[in-house]
């Protein structure tokens, strides 16, 4: 067998660091069987079978002019074998990041803090970790190491699923590299992490017969679950064309009537999602969707709105009944602070 | 010869904006995190910002979240810091710096002076 | 985030004496510790990484030791061109925090 160990990576390459002295390994001959190594394509002896070194080629201080393949002969000039000399350097801690979509799964993602220039794989395991005694804040690594599977075609990725929202874990990213491994640890908690996605679907319709009011709708992220335990809350931004500034309201449920907009112009509407009782942090806007109010006269039978904002409107005084709310019941961890039945809304 | 040097620095009003820029010379700038530190007028050393090699993950001091916008040009080895609503707390001298493993920084520009005044 | 303190905020020393200054986490944090050197007007520098390792080109005099929470560093013979504030730096998550900094002179 070979007395040279095989460092993960491709077979024949042989790897060291920069301004490090560096050995090389004959890998076709016995342990100290005396050696002579040249650089492939050059007759020039670096080492003679006289070093005192056995199978071993020693670079001092080696840089980049030494990189490439090497031979060793022995003794009676039969092929002792070829290696590769790569140079690079032992893997740093990687910069590690993980995030929440919902509250049953999050990911972490990672980059390397720095390039080592040499073959490189990444492990990764979390374990769930429990609070130590009733009333004890100490926590310690309790349940797993479990993998974090990775995310196929090399995206540097892992998904854990099933997570407990209450629970902490510590994320575990070793870098590997021929030189060694690095590891990066991250406590997360899901509550912190969360960030739903944006709402999806969202219309902006005008309200016949009301300059100044646009009725905007939308739905749940299809990435938050279908039964949701956790309600989401939102936040509407509005905004006439070519104005700068937005102005801002939380909508009770998944529609909201604005009813300030300014007559005959275009208004950008855009929405935000967050939970329901402020873990994590808000959603990315949605992409903006855009509306005119209407230019017409009353009609005669008056659509049904969702809680609306009483600004002064040259308007009559109109009573209309809510649409129903989604039907997402609420976990037993919140109680829902709005009515269980909406009030008429009163039109101003 | 490895160094940074940073520039960009100067006089601004409260909300204004500046973007500073650290340029690296004598090492592979792109195998390396980099890193923006900042030192008030008498005070102690800040950690404001960093970057991994691709650009792909950035982290900021809470106290320039979503102000302040760190990024880098690989191809020009050029790493840029865009402050934004500047306020006269954010007067310092900014220093660009070479972590080793995200945070041991062995290598430092001479800085810039940023001054937020009205 | 991580908080660090050191002691003492400043001192004053002969020259050739032995110069020591504490520096404490508020939580454990390896190893990922280090120490620098500043002087008036200029970048700091680093003099010693991962608590106790001496940093290329650093004199022999400057040490460090700790680990967790708790971290020490020495001047064994204090030089006139020692003359500078020393700041503990921990990297043991994403967002490095300094020490307030010592500031070292002469008596």
């Known amino acids: 067998s070979s007395p040279c160990p095989q460092a993960w990576g491709p077979p024949g390459v042989q790897y060291g660091q920069p301004g490090r002295s560096v050995k090389l390994c004959c890998p076709g001959v016995t342990a100290g069987d005396p050696v002579s190594w040249f650089r492939d394509g050059e007759p020039k002896l670096l080492q003679g079978p006289d070093s005192g070194l056995g199978h071993e080629l020693v670079l001092a201080q080696a840089d980049s002019t030494d990189e490439g393949t090497y031979i060793c002969q022995t003794l009676d000039g039969a092929l002792g074998g070829t290696v590769t000399l790569q140079l690079g350097y032992p893997p740093a801690r990687p910069v590690v990041s993980c995030q929440a979509a919902d509250y049953e799964n999050f990911s972490c993602t990672w980059s390397p803090s720095q390039i080592s220039g040499l073959p490189t794989r990444y492990l990764t395991s979390y374990r769930k970790k429990t609070v130590l005694g009733a009333d004890s804040q100490r926590r310690s690594p309790s349940t797993g190491p479990w993998p974090c599977p990775q995310d196929p075609l090399g995206a540097a990725r892992c998904v854990v699923h099933g997570a407990e929202f209450w629970s902490q874990y510590r994320i575990n990213v070793t870098e590997v590299n021929p030189l060694g491994a690095s590891t990066r640890l991250l406590d997360v908690s899901l509550q912190s992490i969360l960030r739903p996605d944006p709402p999806q679907g969202l219309r902006v319709e005008s309200v016949p017969g009301y300059p100044r009011r646009l009725r905007a709708s939308w739905t749940y992220p299809a990435s938050w679950p279908c039964q949701p335990h956790f309600l989401l809350k939102f936040r509407l931004q509005y905004r006439p064309a070519q104005h700068p500034a937005w102005s801002t309201v939380e909508p009770a449920g998944l529609e909201e009537v604005i009813t300030d907009a300014v007559a005959g112009l275009p208004h950008a509407v855009r929405v935000s999602a967050r939970d329901f009782l402020d873990a994590g942090t808000w959603s990315t806007w949605s992409p903006e969707a855009w509306g005119t109010p209407s230019t017409g006269t009353i009609p005669k039978e008056i659509p049904a709105w969702g809680q609306l904002h009483t600004q002064p409107e040259v308007e009559p005084q109109v009573d209309s009944p809510a649409p129903p709310r989604p039907s997402l019941q609420p976990h037993p961890r919140l109680l829902d602070h709005r009515d269980s039945v909406e009030q008429v809304a009163v039109l101003a | 010869e490895v160094q940074l040097l940073e520039s960009g620095g100067g006089l601004v009003q409260p909300g204004g904006s500046l973007r500073l820029s650290c340029a690296a010379s004598?090492?592979?700038?792109?195998?390396?995190?980099m890193t923006w530190v900042r030192q008030a007028p008498g005070k102690g050393l800040e950690w404001v910002s960093s970057?991994?090699?691709?650009?792909?993950?950035?982290q900021y001091a809470d106290s320039v979240k979503g102000r302040f916008t760190i990024s880098r040009d690989n191809s020009k080895n050029t790493l840029y810091l865009q402050m934004n609503s500047l306020r006269a707390e954010d007067t310092a001298v900014y220093y660009c710096?070479?972590?080793?493993?995200?945070?041991?920084?062995?290598?430092w520009g001479r800085g810039t002076l940023v001054t937020v005044s009205s | 985030d991580i908080q660090m303190t050191q002691s003492p905020s400043s001192l004053s020393a002969s020259v050739g004496d032995r110069v020591t200054i504490t520096c404490q986490a508020s939580?454990?944090?390896?190893?990922?510790l280090n120490w620098y050197q500043q002087k008036p007007g200029k970048a700091p520098k680093l003099l010693i990484y991962?608590?106790?390792n001496l940093q290329t080109g650093v004199p022999s005099r400057f040490s460090g030791s700790g680990s967790g929470t708790d971290f020490t560093f020495t001047i064994s013979s204090l030089q006139p061109e020692d003359i500078a504030t020393y700041y503990c730096?921990?990297?043991?998550?994403?967002?490095?925090?300094f020490g307030p900094g010592t500031k070292v002179d002469i008596k």
């Open positions: 710096a070479k972590p080793h493993d995200w945070g041991r920084f062995d290598l």
């Open positions: 004598g090492f592979t700038f792109s195998w390396y995190s």
């Open positions: 970057i991994v090699p691709s650009g792909g993950h950035t």
């Open positions: 939580q454990d944090i390896n190893n990922y």
């Open positions: 991962d608590a106790s």
């Open positions: 730096q921990q990297y043991d998550n994403l967002s490095p925090t």
